[in-house]
Amino acid sequence: TPLGPKWPEPVFGRLASPGFPGEYANDQERRWTLTAPPGYRLRLYFTHFDLELSHLCEYDFVKLSSGAKVLATLCGQESTDTERAPGKDTFYSLGSSLDITFRSDYSNEKPFTGFEAFYAAEDIDECQVAPGEAPTCDHHCHNHLGGFYCSCRAGYVLHRNKRTCSALCSGQVFTQRSGELSSPEYPRPYPKLSSCTYSISLEEGFSVILDFVESFDVETHPETLCPYDFLKIQTDREEHGPFCGKTLPHRIETKSNTVTITFVTDESGDHTGWKIHYTSTAQPCPYPMAPPNGHVSPVQAKYILKDSFSIFCETGYELLQGHLPLKSFTAVCQKDGSWDRPMPACSIVDCGPPDDLPSGRVEYITGPGVTTYKAVIQYSCEETFYTMKVNDGKYVCEADGFWTSSKGEKSLPVCEPVCGLSARTTGGRIYGGQKAKPGDFPWQVLILGGTTAAGALLYDNWVLTAAHAVYEQKHDASALDIRMGTLKRLSPHYTQAWSEAVFIHEGYTHDAGFDNDIALIKLNNKVVINSNITPICLPRKEAESFMRTDDIGTASGWGLTQRGFLARNLMYVDIPIVDHQKCTAAYEKPPYPRGSVTANMLCAGLESGGKDSCRGDSGGALVFLDSETERWFVGGIVSWGSMNCGEAGQYGVYTKVINYIPWIENIISDF
């Protein structure tokens, strides 16, 4: 019998009955064995078929078989109820080999022409399976010429049997205080040949509780305990299980913070698996009782490990840990059932004793010594000599612990000295230099350095003077001996002040005229204001209306008198303002250089002479009475004049202070 072609030869060809296309002879038996490469099958179809028809093809027939299985026994020309002819059918081998047998018996009633068939090898699609048959692969099947291979979905790995997909279900660690875990694919059937390990790992102090929920279906056996698939639960204390079957296991209180769940499946079965909801518990901490005037948040029925609460105080109360202030407070429950922090208190805010007000006083309004939340105090300044600047002096203890004014300021009010107060009122007539009486010129300052000079007190820590009077001491301010509150130049009874800094106008040039002859001395301490020490006012914008030609100003000082000596007692003189052009003209003649009198100067004195300031008066104030405010202000600073004081036709020249208000204000605000 011909074997037919064998792989690796090309596997295709033609088969025919002996003598085809002529009739075949009696008593013929012919057998062909066709073999295809592995992974291929053989396809066979007939182009001609004409055999004697007999019951169940007992006489003449063509038999197709593959391995042990007969695929078909064929005879006749067309199929009947009991016999089959190939017609247009195509026949396929079950494996890679196909046996074809032709047989004719001892006689034919008429001639039959036999058969002609063609065959070829073709790839088997192993991925195609008949309905009801097990799939070739668990997940994905991939056909290729001569074979196939399987692959798995994400989260699975191909088993060594090359067909089953085992779940990659180990190494999952659950660290939350509660959660859910289930068999792979739950509630769909779980995968075969898998070994899953799940860990629940909570912080020490927690105890894990396991509840099986919804459904439980793990392959079981009627006699043996979970021989196929099983679920086991292991803690550091004990093992629970194995579990299988269809009954939900009971709750498991593990009394452990770590749990390992193992699930093992075999190669067969179709079961939906399991689902576990886990929770945890721990030793509760004592219930936090809110301190008076405070509340706890969040409010819970109980607080266990890692639970926390915060304390919030009512407005006007503050968190205090004993005496220590806290902005916020949160306590956390520990594994031993204690809170990690001691409970603070909500204490009423205490602003404490109010700061002393320089040159003022404070009065408790709410009650003697009451300094707690919403308490009210009233600051006031020492009457007559001080006035309150900025606010009304009423302060309230606010929730932030600070005394706060009605304008929201937390700084103290300021008691500013009242300026321009004098015991003297101007008489309006001009008369000779006179001795000053106590309180007449309380702004008068005696400056002793290299020479004797004067100045005028501004506020309670500045002295206004002439630049030329303090020029030599500009770099050694501490060398200036500043005295006030006395009439007698040589008296041991005076208020001593010391200079912190000297500010000479940047436009002043020493020994080159007296333009910008103005300076400020900052005192290193504030002086106490009283009837003998009071600052002079600075001129208001409207002050020029009190400083017109012939208006009377008053100059005071310890300068040279008519006898040529420094005065022992403070002297003063009332003198009129001189027309500026007239004064300019008086100093145009030699020995005075042209332009000696500038717009920054004003002149005062009598044309007839005799009333003037002199050497030793330099830096002192020429003051005027503001009739609207009834306060004295400084209009001029004693600067220069004729060589012979009080000379007829010559006048005293004073620095015009109103021109320097911005400069004065800038220096004082900056320093």
Partner: antibody, heavy 117, light 112 residues
Framework: EVQLQESGPGLVKPSQSLSLACTVT?????????WHWIRQFPGNKLEWMGF???????NYNPPLTSRISITRDTSKNQFFLQLNSVTTEDTATYYC??????????WGQGTLVTVSA | NVLMTQTPLSLPVSLGDQASISCRSS???????????LEWYMQKPGQSPKLLIY???RRFSGVPDRFSGSGSGTDFTLKISRVEAEDLGVYYC?????????FGAGTKLELK
């Protein structure tokens, strides 16, 4: 972690003022808690001087109230000690520290101040 | 002022010994809020003091569990279960319940 560092002159003349700064890193002095000054005299006796709170309020050891001032500069995260009219009795190592539920959990390394003419 | 009295002033020990330091206050340290603000500090030469224990028995972070504090009212104790070389130094008790807050004079833990 919070760190504190004291700085200031090591020598002060009697009757003058002692001024020290404490520079804080790793935590804002306005965020919470109290910020303290403590001193340790020769012989190791420790004395709490006072504190300034996160809000800027102060609390002083009563015997020192008339001559102590604790202030701060929030922009530089520093707080300061000024002790006026010092005498040789004020010679000590001065520490700054931070509180919590305890008084002095975090300390600076300390700075020695000698009061001497 | 609350006076804090420590005993002994000097405590000679061998490494591995248990050490116990006592502190007594001149008045109760129970604050009006119910807490007791008693603290223990330890200082080594040339270093700043370090907090060990607060509110009588709470250990500060990083403090080994061989240190423990106990007591109530006016009597308090610091115990070191097994003394190690790094534990040698001066120990101070401190009260924060009453202002002005005050320290004890110190107990020197030294080797025998």
């Amino acid at each position: 972690e919070v760190q504190l560092q004291e700085s200031g002159p090591g020598l002060v003349k009697p009757s003058q003022s002692l001024s020290l700064a404490c520079t804080v890193t790793g935590y804002s002095i306005t965020s919470d808690y109290a910020w303290h000054w403590i001193r340790q005299f020769p012989g190791n006796k420790l004395e709490w001087m006072g504190f300034i709170s996160y809000s800027g309020r102060t609390n002083y050891n009563p015997p020192l109230t008339s001559r102590i001032s604790i202030t701060r500069d929030t922009s530089k995260n520093q707080f300061f000690l000024q002790l006026n009219s010092v005498t040789t009795e004020d010679t000590a190592t001065y520490y700054c520290a931070r509180s919590y539920d305890y008084w002095f959990g975090y300390w600076g390394q300390g700075t020695l101040v000698t009061v001497s003419a | 002022n609350v006076l804090m009295t420590q005993t002994p002033l000097s405590l000679p020990v061998s490494l591995g010994d248990q050490a116990s330091i006592s502190c007594r206050s001149s008045q109760s340290l129970v604050h009006s809020n119910g807490n007791t603000y008693l603290e223990w500090y330890m200082q080594k030469p040339g270093q700043s003091p370090k907090l060990l224990i607060y509110t009588v028995s709470r250990r500060f972070s990083g403090v080994p569990d061989r240190f423990s504090g106990s007591g109530s009212g006016t009597d308090f104790t610091l115990k070191i279960s097994r003394v190690e070389a790094e534990d040698l130094g001066v120990y101070y008790c401190f009260q924060g319940s009453h202002v002005p807050v005050t320290f004890g004079a110190g107990t020197k833990l030294e080797l025998k």
